[in-house]
Each structure stands twice: as C-alpha cells, then as structure tokens.
C-alpha cells in the first residue's frame, strides 16, 4: 500500500484527540450549480401522495434549517380530488450527515451525526395481512 | 439569532478563517436508535411511482457509497399493474453533505461539500400547456 | 485492484491475547470502512466488528463488545483487530473486508487463530 | 440481531442445471440483501449487492430477486466452478450471514 505522506501542506495532528477530532473546512462546495431544487419543483403539491414542508430549526447544528415533509393524507389523491384509502402516502426518508456544536455554544467545534429526514411522500400499495 | 458565547472550554478561534474552518469530532453519532429505518422499507418496489437505487461510488468520499434512485417508468403503475402515461413518476431530490479529503491524503484535514441526490419517486399530475 | 493481505496463522492458550493485521496494497483504505468477519471450523460467517480509519469511528457486534478492539494506522494502511480472554470457541479464520456500509466486497485471504492449551 | 434463514442447507446438481437458493430474513430489510461464493479455504467473494445488483467481474448465469423478507439467489446454468457454500447477508442493521447453503455435484 502507499505510505500516506505527512506533508508540510497537512494540518497538524499533535491534538491528543487526533484522528477523532479533525479540521473541517465549511467553505463548502457545491456540486449542484442549479438553483435548490426543493425551491424550485412543485411536486409536494402535484403529487398523488402530497406533502407538507415543515421547517426544522436547530441553532446548533449545521445545516441549522432542515425542511421535513409529513404528508397531508392517509391515502393518495384519485384523479377527482379524493382520497382513496385503499393506497398509501409514505415518507420517503433519508439519513443525512450534519454537524452538531459540542461543547453546545462553541462556534467552531462540531460533531457528526447522522439523522434521518423524511424528504418527500410516495403512494404505496398496502401491506394486507390476511388472518388464517 | 441566539449570540454564542465564547466560553473558555471551546477550541480556540483565532484562525483568520475561523468560522469557515472548524474542528469536528469524527465519531458519529447516530440518532436513528430503532433498527436502521432507512434501510427497512420496500416502497421502492410498492409505489405508483416505482425506483430501482443504483450504486453511486466514491473511495474519495464519506460515505463512499450512496444510493440514487431511478424512477422506472414515465407514467406511474396502476391497480391492474399497467402504467398510465396521464401522470408522471418523478424524482425526489435532496441536498446531502459529504466529506472530501482535502488535501488529498491528509489524514486529518476534511472539507465540507454539498450534493443533490435522488432519494426515491413520487406519482404527479402532469403540467399541461394550453397553446393558444 | 485492492487486495487486503492479513498477517500468519497464530497458536495462543487460553485467556491470552492475538492481534491480527490487515494491510491495503494497490490504494490506501479511502473512505471505506474494514469489517472483521470471523469463521469457525465448519461454520458459517460471523460479524465481530469495523472501522473507518478515515474517522478511527469503530463499531462493534454486541456479542464482542468489551473483548475485541478494532485499530487503524493510516501511515501504512494498516487494519487490526485484538480478541482478548481466548478460548478454545474462538478457534476460527479471521477476515477482514472492505465493507462499503452496505456490502463487503474485498477481503483478506484469512488469519487461523488456534486457541489451545 | 436480524436472523437469515437459508434453504437447502445442502442440494446436489448436475452441470447445467438451473439452481435456486432461497434466503428469509426475520424481519423486513428491504433490499440491503448480498450473496456471497465461497470456495474451501478461500475468503468468500462477492457475487449480487442489495438484492439484485450483479457484482462487477460476476458471470451473468448469477442472478438474485426479492425483497423485504424473501430473497433468491439463481444459478441460470450451473458450471463446474460453480460447487461452493453460497452465503446471503443482510445490511440492513449490523450484518449477519445466513447459515450457508452447500451446492455438491450429484
């Protein structure tokens, strides 16, 4: 294997916490050059299972405004307006990565945690369980 | 906002980038404590708006493997399993953080980056455009 | 192509220690994490425990938990794992696997420990 | 801990034959669902990720299917190199293997 060189240009790792504790740079880079998508498409409206974007803030993580969607009905939307109860609206969620200040309060020490968000709703055919 | 006091048990700021290069612990913590929820539902398959996850790879990046989904038709799935191509499988997209070594093989100097994933499919109501 | 390659075969006694190493050739370990996965004569496989060396993040089986430790030197892309207070149940072929978190899809060639007294 | 159930534990073929391995988890686990080939005294190697994922480098006559808790691994054409001991594995929680399914020439 390749001995990982620990050049000049590397932060320094005396810290006796070194390697749990590491330098992150938050000058963060972003691959998507579109505007955010969850701003721009309409599908929590359009969607047979739709959704609600409630606003999830915490001023000690990163990012500190997450959106989670709980969708608005038990059942999916028919092509007349109504609800069939016969089908399923469901989170679709996701475990992201964030960053949570500990100690609380300090402004540039972190912890990474992963969390699960709903990010939208899908309609799903029901489980049926038949009794003997 | 709240203003964050600088208490004496934080890390010290005086880097001239400071807040834009902070100090992480890198001993995850999972807040999904149930058996792993986002690994235990088959909605992919049960949708209206039906996925298959392909396999995004990365050994540059943490995580290294993350799942994109695919919708699998235009249309979405009907009760007697044809695809109606009135309505539209889309993708739900979410923006994930990831880590990148930065530099390369520095064992302990990481940057932040942003990208959109493709977390599952919704069933929508197409936009029809009237012509004049 | 990555290729793990584990440290030799080891006879310990009862109650003692083995360390067994696992080094990454062709690529340093990346952002992957390294499983060990042990076997017992003529039985199937069993997860003990992984690591991300990029993190030093550690997770273990709850049946190893307090016994096994699991290490990582980045400067030579080397994995280890310790099972302390041997004994003869934990005579087995130890590997050690590049897990993607998802799947395992590299691995050692296998280390025999032979507990016996 | 999720328990994986393997059936049969053994089964005896012919080259050519079509091979089916069934593999039930104790609870749902989506499709984080791998097989595994091993061969004696080797380390076992990867042949199909989450359910049905041909593994790169993995003959096409392997194929896998499922979802949830019920899962199949085929063997479209059975091949001499093919007599082994086939393992599933769940990543839904921490893995754990399946007991082993032994495919013996007939």
């Known amino acids: 294997g390749i001995a990982i060189p620990r050049n000049s240009g590397c932060p320094n790792s005396e810290d006796k916490n070194f390697p749990r504790t590491v330098m992150v740079n938050l000058n963060i880079h972003n691959r998507n050059t579109s505007t955010n998508p969850k701003r721009s498409s309409d599908y929590y409206n359009r969607s047979t299972s739709p959704w609600n974007l409630h606003r999830n803030e915490d001023p000690e993580r990163y990012p500190s405004v997450i959106w989670e969607a709980k969708c608005r009905h038990l059942g999916c939307v028919k092509a007349d307006g109504n609800v069939d109860y016969h089908m399923n609206s469901v989170p679709i969620q996701q475990e992201i990565l964030v960053l949570r200040r500990e100690p609380r309060h300090c402004p540039n020490s972190f912890r990474l945690e992963k969390i699960l968000v709903s990010v939208g709703c899908t309609c799903v055919t029901p489980i049926v369980h038949h009794v003997a | 906002g709240i203003a964050i006091p600088r208490n004496s048990g934080c890390p010290n700021s005086e880097d001239k980038n400071f807040p834009r290069t902070v100090m992480v612990n890198l001993n995850i913590h999972n807040r999904n404590t149930s058996t792993n929820p986002k690994r235990s539902s088959d909605y992919y398959n049960r949708s209206t708006s039906p996925w298959n996850l392909h396999r995004n790879e990365d050994p540059e990046r943490y995580p290294s493997v993350i799942w994109e989904a695919k919708c699998r038709h235009l249309g979405c799935v009907k009760a007697d399993g044809n695809v109606d191509y009135h309505m539209n499988s889309v993708p739900i997209q979410q923006e994930i953080l990831v880590l990148r070594r930065e530099p390369r093989h520095c064992p302990n100097s990481f940057r932040l980056e942003k990208i959109l994933v493709s977390v599952g499919c919704t069933c929508v109501t197409p936009i029809v455009h009237h012509v004049a | 192509q990555v290729q793990l390659v584990q440290s030799g075969a080891e006879v310990k006694k009862p109650g003692s220690s083995v360390k067994v190493s696992c080094k990454a050739s062709?690529?340093?370990?990346?952002?992957?994490?390294i499983s060990w996965v042990r076997q017992a004569p003529g039985q199937g496989l069993e997860w003990m425990g992984s690591i991300i060396p990029w993190f030093g993040y550690t997770n273990y089986a709850q049946k190893f938990q307090g016994r096994v430790t699991i290490t990582a030197d980045e400067s030579t892309s080397t994995a280890y794992m310790e099972l302390s207070s041997l004994r003869s149940e934990d005579t087995a072929v130890y590997y050690c696997?590049?897990?993607?978190?998802?799947?395992?899809?590299?691995w050692g060639q296998g280390t025999l420990v032979t507990v016996s007294s | 801990d999720i328990q994986m159930t393997q059936s049969p534990s053994s089964l005896s073929a012919s080259v050519g034959d079509r091979v089916t391995i069934t593999c039930r988890a104790s609870?749902?686990?989506?499709?984080?669902l791998n097989w595994y080939q091993q061969k004696p005294g080797k380390a076992p190697k990867l042949l199909i990720y989450a359910a049905s994922s041909l593994q790169s480098g993995v003959p096409s006559r392997f194929s896998g299917s499922g979802s949830g808790t019920d899962f199949t691994l085929t063997i479209s054409s059975l091949q001499p190199e093919d007599f082994a001991v086939y393992y599933c594995?769940?990543?839904?929680?921490?893995?754990?293997f399946g007991q082993g399914t032994k495919v013996e020439i007939k």
């Open positions: 594995q769940q990543y839904s929680d921490d893995p754990t």
């Open positions: 696997a590049r897990d993607s978190e998802y799947y395992f899809d590299h």
């Open positions: 609870q749902g686990i989506s499709n984080w």
């Open positions: 062709g690529g340093t370990f990346s952002s992957y994490a």
